[in-house]
Interface confidence: low
C-alpha cells in the first residue's frame, strides 16, 4: 500500500540499526572517495530526519521520495566538483534522471588503496572502544570498493565480523583466532561481490527478463518440489529485490528481501523441506542461509522431459500461444531435473530449445524437425563438462598457485593487450576456482566452476569496457552473458599482437620483495610471468617453467643471503640474461 512518508515507512520496517547501515552503504557506493566521517555525518542527518517523519508523517519534506532526499543530501556536499568531476553534473538533473546519472558514475575499479586489516591488538582496542563506529568503518570501506555489493548481505557480513571480534578479542592469542576467521569472511564476501555484480550486469544489459530467467533456473534446481507457479512467484520477487539493490534503492531492497524470506518460511510446505534450519535464524542470517540453502531432494517420479517438450503433438501450438510461459516451463522442468548443471548451461539449453522451435514450427513437418533437439543438447553439455575435468585435473596436479600461473599464461596469450594488473587479478581469481570447486563432489563441480568463472569474467568485461584494448575481449564481452565463458574458453593466441620489447627493468627486483607477505610475493612473480608472455606470446610451457623456476630460485637465494642488496644487484642482471636466452 502507499505510505504518506516513504522514509518513515522504511525506518519503521527496518529499525534504526539496519536503516543507518543501509544509508551508509548507499552513500559510500555513490560517492566512493568521501571519508567515513563525511558519510557518517550525512547518515546521522538522514536518520534524524527519518525520526521526525516517524513522529509526524505530515512534517515538511517527509512525503519526498527516497531518491530525492538522498540525492539532495549528496548534492549538498561541499567541493563535489573538485572531488568528483563530472559526477557533479548529475546534480543539475531532476529525479529519476539524477539517480540514473549517479548510477552511471559508480566506479567498479576505484583508485583506492587495498583495504588493509589492522593488527589484532589495535583492532580489538578500537572495536571495544566503539563497536558501532568500528562496524561503520567496515561497511564504508567495503561499500566504496564494491559499489554494487548486495547491501543486505553486507549487513550480514558486518554482523559476522562483529561476532568474530566479540569472540576473538576476549582470547589471549587474538591474532591466531582472528586471522583465519576474518580471512574466511573476506573470501566469502569477495565471491558475493562478484556474483552480485554479475546479477546487476545481467539486469543493466539485458533487462529484468534475463535476470528472471536466471532466477527460474536457479530456484528450480534448489526447489525441485515446488510447482511452476511457486517458482515463478519466487523468481518475480527475487527479481524485484535485485533490481532495487542494483538500482541503489537499498532500503526497499532490504525490506523486500526480508519480506521474501518471511514468505518462504511461511510457505515451506510448497517450497522445500530444507528450509526449517534457515527459518529458525534471526533475519540477516535467515536471508543469507536461504540464499545458499542445499537443494531439496528431487521428486522420484518425474517423467522424461521429452514427453511435454518433444513428443507432445501440441508443442508448436503451445509455444505459439504463450512463448514466455512455455519456455519458462521448459526451463523449470529441465532445471529441476539437473541440479548438476550450471545455471549458464541451463540457459544455453533453453536458448537452443527456443531457437529450434522458432525454426521448426515454421516448417512443414515440425515434429520431424524438432524431434532431435535433446540429442543436439549433447555437445553443449559436453563442453563445460570437459572444461571442468581438464581444469580440475590441472589444479590437482599444480596446486592453486601453479594453476593460477597456467591460467595467467593462457589468458595473457588470449588477450596480451590487457593491462598486466588486470590479467594478474583475473588469473588469480579464476585460479581460485580450483580450491573452491574442484574439491566438491562430482555432481556439484560443474555448477560451481562455470557459474563462478562467469562471474569473474564479468568483472574482466567491466574493467575492459572502461579502456577497451583487445578485440578478443570485446568480442566475448559483447555477446550474451551465458555465452561469455565458452567464448573466452575458445579464444586462442592473439595472432594480431606485436610482442612487447624486452625491458630489463621489468624483471629487475630489489631486496624489499623479501619482506613482502606471501600473497604480495606471488603477485610480483605473476606480474613478471605475464610480462614474459607479452614479450614471447608463443613461448612453450617448458620455456616459461624454466624461467619461473630460475626466478624462484633467485629470490630464494637472495632473500637468504647475508647481504641481500648485493645479491639482488649482482645476481639480478644474470637472471635477466638467462631469461632472455631461455626464451630466445
Amino acid at each position: 500500500e502507499a505510505h504518506k512518508s516513504e522514509i518513515a515507512h522504511r525506518y519503521n520496517d527496518l529499525g534504526e540499526q539496519h536503516f543507518k547501515g543501509l544509508v551508509l552503504i548507499a552513500f559510500s557506493q555513490y560517492l566512493q572517495k568521501c571519508s567515513y566521517d563525511e558519510h557518517a555525518k550525512l547518515v546521522q542527518e538522514v536518520t534524524d530526519f527519518a525520526k521526525t517523519c516517524v513522529a509526524d508523517e505530515s512534517a515538511a519534506n517527509c512525503d519526498k521520495s527516497l531518491h530525492t532526499l538522498f540525492g539532495d543530501k549528496l548534492c549538498a556536499i561541499p567541493n563535489l566538483r573538485e572531488n568528483y568531476g563530472e559526477l557533479a553534473d548529475c546534480c543539475t538533473k531532476q529525479e529519476p534522471e539524477r539517480n540514473e546519472c549517479f548510477l552511471q558514475h559508480k566506479d567498479d575499479n576505484p583508485s583506492l588503496p587495498p583495504f588493509e586489516r589492522p593488527e589484532a591488538e589495535a583492532m580489538c582496542t578500537s572495536f571495544k572502544e566503539n563497536p558501532t563506529t568500528f562496524m561503520g568503518h567496515y561497511l564504508h570501506e567495503v561499500a566504496r570498493r564494491h559499489p554494487y555489493f548486495y547491501a543486505p548481505e553486507l549487513l550480514y557480513y558486518a554482523e559476522q565480523y562483529n561476532e568474530i571480534l566479540t569472540q576473538c578479542c576476549a582470547e589471549a592469542d587474538k591474532e591466531s583466532c582472528l586471522t583465519p576467521k576474518l580471512d574466511g569472511v573476506k573470501e566469502k564476501a569477495l565471491v558475493s561481490s562478484v556474483r552480485q555484480r554479475m546479477k546487476c550486469s545481467s539486469m543493466q544489459k539485458f533487462g529484468e527478463r534475463a535476470f528472471k530467467a536466471w532466477a527460474v533456473a536457479r530456484l528450480s534446481q534448489t526447489f525441485p518440489n515446488a510447482d511452476f507457479a511457486e517458482i515463478t512467484k519466487l523468481a518475480t520477487d527475487l527479481t524485484k529485490v535485485n533490481k532495487e539493490c542494483c538500482h541503489g534503492d537499498l532500503l526497499e531492497c532490504a525490506d523486500d528481501r526480508a519480506e521474501l524470506a518471511k514468505y518462504m518460511c511461511e510457505n515451506q510446505a510448497t517450497i522445500s523441506s530444507k528450509l526449517q534450519t534457515c527459518c529458525d535464524k534471526p533475519l540477516l542470517k535467515k536471508a543469507h542461509c536461504l540464499s545458499e540453502v542445499e537443494h531439496d531432494t528431487m521428486p522420484a517420479d518425474l517423467p522424461a522431459i521429452a514427453a511435454d517438450f518433444v513428443e507432445d503433438q501440441e508443442v508448436c501450438k503451445n509455444y505459439a500461444e504463450a512463448k514466455d510461459v512455455f519456455l519458462g516451463t521448459f526451463l523449470y522442468e529441465y532445471s529441476r531435473r539437473h541440479p548438476d548443471y550450471s545455471v549458464s548451461l541451463l540457459l544455453r539449453l533453453a536458448k537452443k530449445y527456443e531457437a529450434t522451435l522458432e525454426k521448426c514450427c515454421a516448417e512443414a513437418n515440425p515434429p520431424a524437425c524438432y524431434g532431435t533437439v535433446l540429442a543436439e543438447f549433447q555437445p553443449l553439455v559436453e563442453e563445460p563438462k570437459n572444461l571442468v575435468k581438464t581444469n580440475c585435473d590441472l589444479y590437482e596436479k599444480l596446486g592453486e598457485y601453479g594453476f593460477q600461473n597456467a591460467i595467467l599464461v593462457r589468458y595473457t596469450q588470449k588477450a596480451p593487450q590487457v593491462s598486466t594488473p588486470t590479467l594478474v587479478e583475473a588469473a588469480r581469481n579464476l585460479g581460485r576456482v580450483g580450491t573452491k570447486c574442484c574439491t566438491l563432489p562430482e555432481d556439484q563441480r560443474l555448477p560451481c566452476v562455470e557459474d563462478y568463472l562467469s562471474a569473474i569474467l564479468n568483472r574482466v568485461c567491466l574493467l575492459h569496457e572502461k579502456t577497451p584494448v583487445s578485440e578478443h575481449v570485446t568480442k566475448c564481452c559483447s555477446g550474451s552473458l551465458v555465452e561469455r565463458r565458452p567464448c573466452f574458453s575458445a579464444l586462442t593466441v592473439d595472432e594480431t599482437y606485436v610482442p612487447k620489447e624486452f625491458k630489463a627493468e621489468t624483471f629487475t627486483f630489489h631486496s624489499d620483495i623479501c619482506t613482502l607477505p606471501e600473497k604480495e610475493k606471488q603477485i610480483k612473480k605473476q606480474t613478471a610471468l605475464a610480462e614474459l608472455v607479452k614479450h614471447k606470446p608463443k613461448a612453450t610451457a617448458e620455456q616459461l617453467k624454466t624461467v619461473m623456476d630460475d626466478f624462484a630460485q633467485f629470490l630464494d637465494t637472495c632473500c637468504k643471503a647475508a647481504d641481500k642488496d648485493t645479491c639482488f644487484s649482482t645476481e639480478g642482471p644474470n637472471l635477466v640474461t638467462r631469461c632472455k636466452d631461455a626464451l630466445a
Epitope: F228, A229, T236, A320, A322, D324, V325, G328
Partner: nanobody, 123 residues
Framework: EVQLVESGGGLVQAGGSLRLSCAAS????????MGWFRQAPGKERERVVS????????YYADSVKGRFTISRDNAENTVYLQMNSLKPEDTAVYYC????????????????WGQGTLVTVSS
Amino acid sequence: EVQLVESGGGLVQAGGSLRLSCAASGLTFSSYAMGWFRQAPGKERERVVSISRGGGYTYYADSVKGRFTISRDNAENTVYLQMNSLKPEDTAVYYCAAARYWATGSEYEFDYWGQGTLVTVSS
C-alpha cells in the same frame, strides 16, 4: 488509452454464483495475458486467477481452485470469471489486469488495471 472495465459484481448468497466480465480497449487484446485479483477490506490485494494470451494456460490460487473458472474471448476483447459456490470470504473488490508477459500472475507483472467491481457474499 488503455481501459479495462469490470462488470457483473453485486450481492449474492453464500453458495451462489456470479459471472464477472472485463472488457478491454486500447490494447491488442490477444497479445496480453489477463488476470483477476481481489482485495478484501483491510487486506492486501491477492492474485486469484490468470489466463495466457491464447487461453491454453491458466493459473488458479488454491483458495478458488475447483470453484472459479477463467475464460477469454479474443474476438470480443473480453475476459470472464465464473464464480460458483461462493463463500463469505470471497467478499472483496475484484480487479481485472493485463500483462504483456505472463508467468503466473503476481501483481508486479501486470501492466494495466481496471477500477474494480465489488462482490459481496452474505451468509
